[in-house]
């Protein structure tokens, strides 16, 4: 068959998915586009085990994930259901805070330095993680 059995070079395999960890920073929309160009998407976190795996690889870095409410409700970029799925927000988050002085609220989610999630201004440049299923990697 045409399915791949291993991840591309510089990608990390975990539980049937391949992950790529950026070493530079970009706004959420640019990070999202980058992943799409790699035939992938911003990481969608579906379990505590996956969360722990990602944390081990990231260290204390604010890092974009594929979760946004730019178009209304919170949605994962791959269509995974948000309401019934795994969530790991910092206490009192998300809060759509307007007090940052950067304009507007906060519509994009990221890993904070302790791994818990926060909503932040989408145009802030953070690191990011791309994910693709193992049989779609190229």
């Amino acid at each position: 068959g045409s399915e791949r059995t291993c991840c591309p070079i510089n990608w990390v395999e975990y539980e049937g998915s391949c992950y790529w960890f950026s070493s530079s920073v970009r706004p959420w929309t640019e990070a999202d586009k980058y992943c799409q160009l790699e035939n992938a998407h911003l990481v969608v976190v579906t379990s505590r085990d996956e969360q722990n795996f990602l944390q081990r690889h990231m260290g204390p870095l604010n890092t974009w994930i594929g979760l946004t409410d730019q178009n209304g409700p919170w949605k994962w970029v791959d269509g995974t259901d948000y309401e019934t799925g795994f969530q790991n927000w910092r206490p009192e988050q998300p809060d759509n805070w307007y007090g940052h002085g950067l304009g507007g609220g906060e519509d994009c989610a990221h890993f904070t330095t302790d791994g818990r999630w926060n909503d932040d201004v989408c145009r802030r440049p953070y690191r990011w993680v791309c994910e693709t299923k193992l049989d779609k990697a190229n």
Epitope: N62, D114, R116, D120, R124
Partner: antibody
Framework: EVQLVESGGGLVQPGRSLKLSCAAS????????MAWVRQAPKKGLEWVAT????????YYRHSVKGRFTISRDNAKSTHSLQMDSLRSEDTATYYC??????????????WGQGVMVTVSS | DIQMTQSPTSLSASLGETVSIECLTS??????LAWYQQKPGKSPQLLIS???NFQDGVPSRFSGSGSGTQYSLKINSLESEDAATYFC?????????FGGGTKLELK
């Protein structure tokens, strides 16, 4: 009222060990990342180490990595800093500090009174 | 690591005067800056977070401003209790780094 109380400081010879402890009260300890920050005599402040809320990850400044170990006990609302292979440049007042969880912020919002560590022969 | 350059290192002013302390960062920290006050023999106290949000209980004569790589702390109508050392902190990325401090003395 948030309170952080350090203990365990003192005079120690170079190469020896010392363990600092911090007892926390007045807040939900298991929600917060905790840190140690030090201040050498007449000098500025220097972050030393952080342990995240559940103890799952720890972070250190380069100069103490491999010599210092930060840990926590959420059941007892305490955390500690085990300092091994101490050097004269580790001489400082060590502060236990709570890190905020507000948004993506990590600043230190509450500090203990500090405990002096002197490394000298 | 993000470098923090704080100025001046010391400052002498009279009661009622207004003073400013500057903090320059080696890269854009997107307002992730806090200011602390430390009195001799005491631990630091948080004055301002996120560049301009002052903490509960902090007198309104303290204010913070700035963006990008340039930030400042302003103290209006100095009072005797303001004599202290002031530090800035960036918490934009690890490791957190402090400015070298500004010692404020009252004439």
């Amino acid at each position: 009222e948030v309170q952080l109380v350090e203990s365990g400081g003192g005079l120690v010879q170079p190469g020896r060990s010392l363990k600092l402890s911090c007892a926390a009260s007045g807040f939900t300890f298991s929600d917060y990342n905790m840190a140690w920050v030090r201040q050498a005599p007449k000098k500025g402040l220097e972050w030393v180490a952080t342990i995240i809320y559940d103890g799952g990850s720890t972070y250190y400044r380069h100069s103490v990595k491999g010599r210092f170990t930060i840990s926590r006990d959420n059941a007892k609302s305490t955390h500690s800093l085990q300092m091994d292979s101490l050097r004269s440049e580790d001489t400082a007042t060590y502060y236990c500090a709570r890190q905020t969880y507000f948004g993506s912020r990590d600043y230190f919002d509450y500090w203990g009174q500090g405990v002096m560590v002197t490394v000298s022969s | 690591d993000i470098q923090m350059t704080q100025s001046p290192t010391s400052l002498s002013a009279s009661l009622g005067e207004t003073v400013s302390i500057e903090c320059l960062t080696s890269e854009d920290i997107y307002n992730n800056l806090a200011w602390y006050q430390q009195k001799p023999g005491k631990s630091p106290q948080l004055l301002i977070s996120y560049a301009s949000n002052f903490q509960d209980g902090v007198p309104s004569r303290f204010s913070g401003s700035g963006s990008g790589t340039q930030y400042s702390l302003k103290i209006n109508s100095l009072e005797s209790e303001d004599a202290a050392t002031y530090f800035c902190l960036q918490d934009s990325e690890y490791p957190p780094t402090f400015g070298g401090g500004t010692k404020l003395e009252l004439k």
